[in-house]
């Protein structure tokens, strides 16, 4: 039975040209995290594997930095980066947990962070 929950940074906004940390946290389970996939729609950004380290998709290698932790730092933001991002936690023995973050990249200098929220 899957008892865990994914806590994410929720809806966030950032300025064009800036950077943002995409962060998820798995709680309420003792399951072992074996891999985390970071995806934007159907496009892979990166994979963090517990044994192997990080695989950064070549399309993003100049703009994506691993971490902190299992999170991902997205740099040199453009308006085209606006959209949904997903952290997919592969765990043993529970299975897969998915968290969602919505990022809005703003032209203006006013970029406020949204509240944290949970996805069961």
């Amino acid at each position: 039975m899957m008892t865990g929950t994914i806590e994410t940074t929720g809806n966030i906004s950032a300025e064009k040209g800036g950077s943002i940390i995409l962060q998820c946290h798995l709680s309420s389970t003792t399951a072992q995290v074996t891999q985390v996939n970071w995806e934007q729609q159907d496009q892979l950004l990166a994979i963090c594997n517990a044994d192997l380290g990080w695989h950064i998709s070549p399309s993003f290698k100049d703009r994506v930095a691993p971490g902190p932790g299992l999170g991902l730092t997205l740099q040199s933001l453009t308006v085209n980066d606006t959209g949904e991002y997903f952290c997919i936690y592969h765990t043993y023995p529970d299975g897969t947990y998915t968290g969602r973050i919505f990022l809005e990249v703003l032209e203006s200098s006013v970029a406020e962070h949204g509240a944290r929220f949970q996805i069961p």
Epitope: T34, Q35, N49, A50, L52, G53, W54, H55, P58
Partner: antibody, heavy 127, light 107 residues
Framework: QVQLQESGPGLVKPSQTLSLTCTVS??????????WNWIRQHPGKGLEWIGY???????YYNPSLRSRVTISVDTSKNQFSLKLNSVTAADTAVYYC???????????????????WGQGTTVTVSS | EIVLTQSPDFQSVTPKEKVAITCRAS??????LHWYQQKPDQSPKPLIK???QSFSGVPSRFSGSGSGTDFTLTINSLEAEDAATYYC?????????FGGGTKVEIK
């Protein structure tokens, strides 16, 4: 010498689930530097990658099939499996399992070639 | 996803002739390009990895070259047993992809 062998029903009815297993012999599926793939080939056509699984359970699926695919691993049996649900005639194909190797270092890893392939199993979707 | 375009689709060649098959990637894949040979009713057999590294047991008449987006598989002095379909494959970026294949027929 590592060998891979696909097994499963050769005939599946439309809307049902296709289930195949790949048995690894001559080596351990739990090796850190390998990933385990499913590939299919429609009659007279090219190769289509379905997805992979790592021994510890991490997966990545082809986005074109993701909504219908599950790949799982059983390290105790040295096997990994494919489930493809809601099949149609368009899923009729030869299904292959294959071992891919991984290069790792400096905190990063990369996918290499697929060096060992099963002989393939034909799956027909028909009522 | 990275699209691999092979050309030609089909080639009819006389024995001892030289064959060149090209594979073009829709974006740079560095050297993460591999070649497979598939004969009728058989599974693909690895030929060359990382552009130019031959697998063990592969005859020396098979060679590979290229980098970035343009790659070539060359068969020097074709033999009858080389009749097959040849596929390129990239492992640079997920999803992994294959070229559409080049069928080589012996005249």
């Amino acid at each position: 010498q590592v060998q891979l062998q696909e097994s499963g029903p050769g005939l599946v009815k439309p809307s049902q689930t296709l289930s195949l297993t790949c048995t690894v012999s001559g080596g351990s599926i739990s090796s850190v530097y390998f990933y385990w793939n499913w590939i299919r080939q429609h009659p007279g056509k090219g190769l289509e990658w379905i997805g992979y699984i790592y021994y510890s359970g991490g997966t990545y699926y082809n986005p074109s099939l993701r909504s219908r695919v599950t790949i799982s691993v059983d390290t105790s049996k040295n096997q990994f499996s494919l489930k493809l649900n809601s099949v149609t005639a368009a899923d009729t194909a030869v299904y292959y399992c294959a071992r891919g190797s991984i290069a790792a270092g400096g905190g990063y890893f990369y996918y290499n070639d697929m060096d060992v392939w099963g002989q393939g199993t034909t799956v027909t979707v028909s009522s | 996803e990275i699209v691999l375009t092979q050309s030609p689709d089909f080639q009819s060649v006389t024995p001892k002739e030289k064959v060149a098959i090209t594979c073009r990637a829709s974006q740079s894949i560095g050297s993460s390009l591999h070649w497979y040979q598939q004969k009728p009713d058989q599974s693909p057999k690895p030929l060359i990895k990382y552009v130019s590294q031959s697998f063990s047991g592969v005859p020396s008449r098979f060679s590979g070259s290229g980098s970035g987006t343009d790659f070539t598989l060359t068969i020097n002095s074709l033999e009858a047993e080389d009749a097959a379909t040849y596929y390129c494959h990239q492992s640079s970026s997920l999803p992994l992809t294959f070229g559409g294949g080049t069928k080589v027929e012996i005249k």
